[in-house]
């Protein structure tokens, strides 16, 4: 079944209560426009945003009988001429008579007649109509023949994109058959289709078809009011392509539309071949879109590649939500033209600062005021990380201008980074030289403390991403952040007592649920000693507050529980509810405190792994005093397992110094290999392996710098830690660097026991962990490990 037939069938279903063969039509209030009712229009009770009234009429081909319900009688079948009267196209019937077409359509043959309704003739330009009436034997006859096809074609035969030769000079009739059931012929809508005649079929259409001999190019070249668009099309080498065969839709901006553009914008675009071509192509669709087919908002891909939304409001057509079409359906031999009074500018032709919407005006205004806009050169590439207007508090806006400028610089990147280019663990550099971390979650992408909202766009010289909050790059480590805040003094002292201070100091990616001093309310010094006395217990408790990976509260899908595996090994449950983070159903007091090696979420209760039993009465008493949200299991004599810390400590490479250093003058032409041992570098990134996101952590024991050497190679070792002694050693081995890699796998960031895999590489004095494989691999020099 064709779309037309499907909609007709729906109308028939909606009308069956009224009797047999009754169809429900919807008429737009205040107009004479009627449509067979589609499912969507029926439930909306509107077409083109305008209310409709439901009319019940006989379905095509049926008629009423006096005293009977519905339309039980079938319409009589007659020749095409007689059928014109049956469907009420009496003006077309009259013109067919006076033009001597009558005998043709009463006689032998098979015809399809697209007959204009009486109203269509009334709406025809009076001069054109008078011209036809004054020359009935030639002009009128030709005009009517141009509405006819030499064979019977029902709506099911009228396929989208078809061009049928008419009976006048074989001039083409452009058929469009849209999914909403609308069928058009040269953009005239079939309002009553498939009226079978003995020698053909009649389709009533809503306008008189005018002769088409010109292409879109011809029309542009002849129309003075489109001279700006024509000139721009010439500049962009597009005018000729609009003369070729095709089914185009052109939204042609008038000269007045170009006048509305700020002159600077036009001058910039017209001076940029890429932008001007994008601008022109954004006005062209590769499909023919008649105005009559638009009964609601729909998105169409333009020749430029981006989409435009075409909608309607009553009789007006809107593009991207703005009423701008002032002349519709200029049909040409290769498409249709709609004249518009605004120039459509695609994102790809906009400067990055122009991509910002109404919700980012505070950001863009500040960028301009503080002189940062001028640094966004048209031929450069940038990324704006634009916070929404309400992210800027009054306090922020009243800051010293220099501070404010520094804050804004954190929101502009030196390179163009599209949404699809972002990945977990990525480091982005701002124009102020700050480094920002990217965190990718199931339903969110965050940069430092701030997560994105919809609306990323790519422009001519950059991209823009929209953020909920002002981005605040971290300055301090987890340990330093805890140390500077008195609320965490007890937790910090326990951390140090458990020998875990280093863990929060070194580089890495952690999420710490930091209990405030309130979590230890009522704990006596004796009880504290008891806790410190069992190092394994203390480590288990503290490490249950620490999770590998950075989990920002705002990055969680609201209302959904996220199960994470802690460093201690047990699971922790996180959920975002009404802007609050719940940790094991306990409300976090403050979340998303960013640090250089992770994030802190503040809790005012001590957390405890529900699956770990306690075997000591005194410890149980203490824990029950501090932890109320769960029932801690007691299993007499059970002890806390030792947690192998090697997994979380950086692996250090040992270098054997053999003999005394050999000092000698290096002659010209000889070069030196210099190996600089720095802090272990920890890099994390997510790779998709066999369709599963796998988080890869690379811990590198040193960076190396190689200055090519033909013969002699030397190693310089900086021992760090305040020592300044240097030892030179002749390089006796090829193996320069060993890299320790941990691969932590799983679905996104939710680590299950069986999913955790760790690869230990190199000679580290580690306790062998039963579940893990230990592999000695070849030396690998990674890109990250090479400093230039």
């Amino acid at each position: 079944n064709s779309y037309y037939d499907k909609v007709l069938a729906h109308s028939r279903i909606r009308g069956r209560d009224q009797g047999p063969n009754v169809c429900a039509l919807q008429q737009i209030l205040g107009t004479k426009k009627k449509y067979f009712s589609s499912c969507k229009n029926w439930y909306q009770g509107a077409i083109c945003g305008k209310k409709t009234t439901v009319l019940y009429e006989c379905c095509p081909g049926y008629m009423r009988m006096e005293g009977m319900k519905g339309c039980p009688a079938v319409m009589p079948i007659d020749h095409v001429y007689g059928t014109l009267g049956i469907v009420g196209a009496t003006t077309t019937q009259h013109y067919s008579d006076v033009s001597k077409l009558r005998e043709e359509i009463e006689g032998k043959g098979s015809y399809t007649y697209f007959a204009p309704s009486n109203e269509a003739w009334e709406n025809l330009d009076s001069d054109i109509r008078r011209g036809l009436e004054n020359n009935v034997n030639v002009e009128l006859l030709n005009a009517l023949h141009s509405h006819m096809v030499n064979k019977r074609m029902l709506t099911k035969d009228l396929k989208h994109g078809m061009v049928i030769p008419s009976m006048y000079n074989n001039l083409g009739l452009f058929i469009n058959h849209y999914p909403n059931g609308v069928v058009t012929v040269n953009c005239a809508r079939v309002i009553h289709g498939n009226q079978i005649a003995t020698n053909g079929v009649v389709h009533v259409i809503d306008r008189v078809l005018t002769q088409i001999g010109t292409s879109i190019q011809d029309f542009l070249e002849a129309e003075d009011d489109l001279s700006s668009f024509r000139a721009a099309a010439i500049t962009s080498d597009l005018l000729e392509s609009l003369g070729r065969d095709g089914h185009f839709t052109l939204f042609a901006p008038t000269n007045e539309a170009f006048e509305k553009l700020p002159r600077g914008v036009l001058e910039r675009i017209m001076g940029d071949k890429v932008a001007s071509e994008a601008l022109m192509k954004y006005h062209i669709l590769n499909t023919l879109q008649c105005s009559e087919a638009i009964t609601g908002g729909a998105v169409f891909e333009t020749m430029e590649g981006n989409t435009i939304e075409i909608g309607c409001e009553g009789d007006s057509i809107s593009i991207n939500g703005i009423k701008m079409v002032n002349k519709k359906d200029i049909v040409t031999k290769n498409g249709v033209i709609h004249l518009i009074d605004e120039v459509l500018i695609p994102d790809s032709a906009k400067q990055v600062i122009e991509l910002a919407g109404k919700q980012q005006t505070t950001f863009t205004d500040l960028v301009a005021q503080l002189g940062l806009a001028s640094s966004l050169k048209p031929d450069g590439e940038y990324t704006l990380l634009a916070p929404v207007n309400n992210a800027f508090s009054d306090d922020t806006l009243s800051m010293d201008q220099r501070l404010l400028k520094l804050i804004l610089q954190n929101h502009i990147l030196k390179v163009k980074v599209g949404l699809s280019d972002l990945y977990n663990g990525q480091i982005l550099e701002t124009i102020g030289g700050k480094q920002l971390r990217v965190f990718v979650y199931r339903t969110a992408i965050c940069i430092e403390n701030s997560c994105m909202v919809r609306g990323s766009k790519q422009g001519r010289n950059g991209a823009i991403h929209i953020f909920r909050e002002i981005i605040q790059p971290a300055e301090k480590s987890l340990h330093d952040k805890l140390r500077q805040d008195k609320r965490f003094s007890i937790f910090l002292s326990l951390l140090e007592a458990a020998d875990l201070k280093d863990l929060l100091t070194q580089p890495g990616d952690w999420t710490l649920f930091a209990p405030t001093n309130d979590a230890f309310k009522g704990m006596t010094s004796e009880e504290r000693e008891l806790l410190i006395g069992d190092k394994n217990a203390l480590q288990n408790i503290i490490l249950y507050h620490l999770t590998p990976g950075v989990y920002i509260g705002k990055g969680f899908e609201p209302g959904v529980t996220n199960i994470l595996k802690t460093t201690q090994g047990s699971k922790i449950y996180l959920k975002g509810v009404n802007e609050t983070l719940l940790v094991n159903e306990l409300k976090s007091k403050e979340s998303d405190i960013m640090t250089t090696n992770g994030v802190i979420h503040v809790v005012d209760k001590l957390l405890y792994p529900a699956d770990i039993p306690v075997g000591n009465d005194q410890l149980l008493e203490l824990l029950n005093k501090l932890i109320k949200y769960i029932q801690i299991k007691f299993v007499r004599g059970s002890t806390f397992k030792e947690i192998p810390m090697t997994v979380y400590r950086p692996a250090m490479t040992k270098i054997q110094i053999e003999g005394d250093p050999d000092f000698r003058l290096i002659k010209e032409g000889e070069t030196v290999t210099e190996v600089i041992h720095g802090e272990p570098v920890i890099k994390k990134y997510t790779k998709i392996i066999d369709g599963v996101p796998v988080e890869i952590t690379e811990k590198q024991t040193r960076e190396e710098r190689i200055i090519t050497g033909p013969e002699i190679k030397y190693t310089r070792i900086s021992t760090g830690g305040g020592e300044t002694g240097e030892t030179l050693q002749k390089f006796l081995q090829k193996e320069v660097s060993k890299v320790t890699k941990f691969i932590e796998g799983g679905d996104g960031h939710l680590f299950e026991d069986e999913e955790i895999k760790r690869l230990l590489q190199g000679d580290t004095p580690a306790k062998k962990i039963p579940a893990n494989k230990r592999v000695q691999g070849p030396r690998r020099r990674s890109r990250e490990g090479r400093s230039q």
Partner: antibody, heavy 118, light 110 residues
Framework: QVQLVQSGAEVKKPGASVKVSCKAS????????ISWVRQAPGQGLEWMGW????????NYAQKLQGRVTMTTDTSTSTAYMELRSLRSDDTAVYYC???????????WGQGTLVTVSS | QSVLTQSSSASGTPGQTVTVSCSGS????????VNWYQQLPGTAPKLLIY???QRPSGVPDRFSGSKSGTSASLAISGLQSADEADYYC???????????FGSGTKVTVL
Amino acid sequence: QVQLVQSGAEVKKPGASVKVSCKASGYTFTSYGISWVRQAPGQGLEWMGWISAYSGNTNYAQKLQGRVTMTTDTSTSTAYMELRSLRSDDTAVYYCARDMLVVPFDYWGQGTLVTVSS
Amino acid sequence: QSVLTQSSSASGTPGQTVTVSCSGSSSDIGSNRVNWYQQLPGTAPKLLIYSNDQRPSGVPDRFSGSKSGTSASLAISGLQSADEADYYCAAWDDSLSTYVFGSGTKVTVL
């Protein structure tokens, strides 16, 4: 063919005003804008501003803001430029040019010499 | 004082190629297109090149324009005596919100 015909030369005293006309023919007047450009004797060109013949919208050069007014009469396809509070450094040949924006100043009038002298 | 800088004169013999340069800044040529006008002695200017390199109909292909960064140039090949004129470059200036012209280059055919 496109033609822009300007009014004749004018001699004005400092402080006075001058109004130069520019009659267009050979194209649809309201489909294009008109820009005004002046050229002091032996000097380069200076853009004064633009007017839309369709809407009457104007865009004046900052330097002349407050002293210049551009208007159009669509019934006669004529553009006007009035300059007030004339000074001796306003002595120049004043040109009107059809301004399509996409193709700027594609046709020019023959120029009108305005001399400001006491 | 013109915003765009042009060399005051250039010359060549018939048949030669002469290049006229025009230098600006990031707010004019750097951001926007360049147009070129020819003014024959005692006449009104005439549009020669628009949008950096586009020739209006009727302008011979001996005239060509180009732009790079904050400068632009006009090349006249196969120089003819009829080409003796002043040549002006022009661009929109974003910071002044004004259309600015160069100081003009007098081309002489030797």
